[in-house]
């Protein structure tokens, strides 16, 4: 048993049918010695008396808010949560496996640049009685500071019969140098509590591996005289690290017809312009990627050919 | 400890082309190592990230773009002195800081070259003959060093009398390649920045 926060405790259970569970001793936080009784949640049934209460915690029915009273007055509370260990593996019931980039990916994180700011998000089908707490650091043995905000519900989607909820959090490394070569990964830890179930999820990454630039901005077309060709131009996104000559991007320019089946023409360039043939009803899209370290491509910025 | 935005002579940067080749070569070699050594811990998540140049060179700090010198977190106090003549510096106008930066890059390349050659000698003794260093990568390191053209004492190749542990050597190869790829990215950024300056 360990303390998650004041008066909230996590009981770790080896989770299998007929498991013996864990013996837990609760102590009433009071100078009083006599006439103390214990109850669980809203029930008025007295579970025991005395300054300490010994319970065998086996299932969720044994978890909850234990309260000690004296003469009708509440003295203190202890909330017991359960953390299930299933055959040596901590349970992951609360969050959905996003399966990207690999199985057992519960937290996904992205950064728009090298400033040390990043966003993480996760999915769940649970809509109520759910709380999250996020901590982060650079490295784990001698951790350096990363400050995270509060997790917020950022999107709701309908997936088949189920509603899916996306939560996200923004974090900022306290002293980040965009040019630094990372040798210690960023660690992100999310505590999740659903009703009386506690779970924790972690992700470890280098900022360089989670970079996903914003799409190029100011995408414009300039028709070339007496030609079906157009000059496409764009600019680096505002959120990208500067100077751009140091933090350079490479670009992919795509000409896509109205039908998805039509052949796509693609051009790769390090410049911020390209000359392409504009077909009728087609659209021109440009996306960006770090020129030197191949992390994710940005989303597409698009303009119609007409 | 930074690079001023100077305007060196046009076409002064043969090093840009070489640094691009270097990044391509090390990335290809790393990919090959990860495929060939699939049953070894060779991915970024699995290896320890070690920098063999740590406390010996200070490339990131010496080559910091001027725009980042206002960022306190980028200003590390490590000081290293380097010899300051080189053919990538095609103009006398080029600052002392730029010379310091390029000589730091040269020292990095020299250290990695020695490590890779020592490692290759060990890998050639492996009866499994599972993986060797790409000669192209070693050649590209050499070309960039020649383009930088700094006078520097030659570092003798390390030789070891004891029987090599091939498992450890292959894991060390992965660690070195990951670190060298990160340094090659920094070198490429620096060359691109200098080329635009």
């Amino acid at each position: 048993i360990w303390e998650l926060k004041k008066d909230v405790y996590v009981v770790e259970l080896d989770w299998y049918p007929d498991a013996p569970g864990e013996m837990v001793v609760l102590t009433c936080d009071t100078p009083e010695e006599d006439g103390i009784t214990w109850t669980l949640d809203q029930s008025s049934e007295v579970l025991g008396s005395g300054k300490t209460l010994t319970i065998q915690v086996k299932e969720f029915g044994d978890a909850g808010q234990y309260t000690c009273h004296k003469g009708g007055e509440v003295l203190s509370h202890s909330l017991l949560l359960l953390h299930k260990k299933e055959d040596g593996i901590w349970s992951t019931d609360i969050l959905k496996d996003q399966k990207e980039p690999k199985n057992k990916t519960f937290l996904r994180c992205e950064a728009k640049n090298y400033s040390g700011r990043f966003t993480c998000w996760w999915l769940t089908t649970i809509s109520t009685d759910l709380t999250f707490s996020v901590k982060s650091s650079r490295g784990s043995s001698d951790p350096q500071g990363v400050t995270c905000g509060a997790a917020t519900l950022s999107a709701e989607r309908v997936r088949g019969d189920n509603k899916e909820y996306e939560y996200s959090v923004e974090c900022q490394e306290d002293s980040a140098c965009p040019a630094a070569e990372e040798s210690l990964p960023i660690e992100v830890m999310v505590d999740a509590v659903h009703k009386l179930k506690y779970e924790n999820y972690t992700s470890s990454f280098f900022i360089r591996d989670i970079i996903k630039p914003d799409p190029p901005k100011n995408l414009q077309l300039k028709p070339l005289k007496n030609s079906r060709q157009v000059e496409v131009s764009w600019e680096y996104p505002d959120t990208w690290s500067t100077p751009h000559s140091y933090f350079s991007l490479t670009f992919c320019v795509q000409v896509q017809g109205k039908s998805k089946r039509e052949k796509k023409d693609r051009v790769f360039t390090d410049k911020t312009s390209a000359t392409v043939i504009c077909r009728k009803n087609a659209s021109i899209s440009v996306r960006a990627q770090d020129r030197y370290y191949s992390s994710s491509w940005s989303e597409w910025a698009s303009v119609p050919c007409s | 400890r930074n690079l001023p935005v100077a305007t060196p002579d046009p076409g002064m940067f043969p090093c840009l082309h070489h640094s691009q080749n270097l990044l391509r070569a090390v990335s290809n070699m790393l990919q090959k190592a990860r495929q060939t050594l699939e049953f070894y811990p060779c991915t970024s998540e699995e290896i320890d990230h070690e920098d063999i140049t740590k406390d010996k060179t200070s490339t990131v700090e010496a080559c910091l773009p001027l725009e980042l010198t206002k960022n306190e977190s980028c200003l590390n106090s490590r000081e290293t002195s380097f010899i300051t003549n080189g053919s990538c510096l095609a103009s006398r106008k080029t600052s002392f800081m730029m010379a310091l930066c390029l000589s730091s890059i040269y020292e990095d390349l020299k250290m990695y070259q020695v490590e890779f050659k020592t490692m290759n000698a060990k890998l050639l003794m492996d009866p499994k003959r599972q993986i060797f260093l790409d000669q192209n990568m070693l050649a590209v390191i050499d070309e960039l060093m020649q383009a930088l053209n700094f006078n520097s004492e030659t570092v003798p190749q390390k030789s070891s009398l004891e029987e090599p542990d091939f498992y450890k050597t292959k894991i060390k190869l992965c660690i070195l390649l990951h670190a060298f790829r990160i340094r090659a990215v920094t070198i490429d950024r620096v060359m691109s920045y200098l080329n635009a300056s």
Partner: antibody, heavy 115, light 111 residues
Amino acid sequence: QVQLVQSGGGVVQPGRSLRLSCAASGFTFSSYGMHWVRQAPGKGLEWVAFIRYDGSNKYYADSVKGRFTISRDNSKNTLYLQMKSLRAEDTAVYYCTTHGSHDNWGQGTMVTVSS
Amino acid sequence: SYVLTQPPSVSGTPGQRVTISCSGGRSNIGSNTVKWYQQLPGTAPKLLIYGNDQRPSGVPDRFSGSKSGTSASLAITGVQAEDEADYYCQSYDSSLWGSRVFGTGTKVTVL
């Protein structure tokens, strides 16, 4: 006392279907994940499928993916394995087992796929 | 479909120490716990060891398990006639939740 009682085995022709059941008692069935494991005659144990405690996620061995479906009815304390497009190589004793460090096994039920 | 490799058979005389090896990889034994089962002819497997080296109550202390890296082993110190059976190691595949991987099985013969 944890008990898993299996039924539904038998002889079936290739290409046909069969449904196995596993009735659980002596524990809170709805709180635990469940597996199906099989053993071909004279061969070793092979994992077939797994279902989470609430039925939200199901996982299958490549050899049965797309043909077998694991399901559960927590109100009836019963685990199922629906087997379609059966092949001769599916001939085996099928066991249901609880998920956990200490697992409980059913008595096994024989499925024979033969023409 | 057997990811974990065991010797097909091992034998020993009563009182001898018998060990069975179980070899896997980084995605199974390397990152998950190992179990051992004993299976007597015509019966369901019985759990002998869980969590690499833990014995459930009721299992004699002559059975012990260990794990190192991507391999595990089961030792029977002072093997007895009733220990003649098939033994299987089991772990999980890290890439797929709940995916149990079993060893090829070892027949223990008491001479």
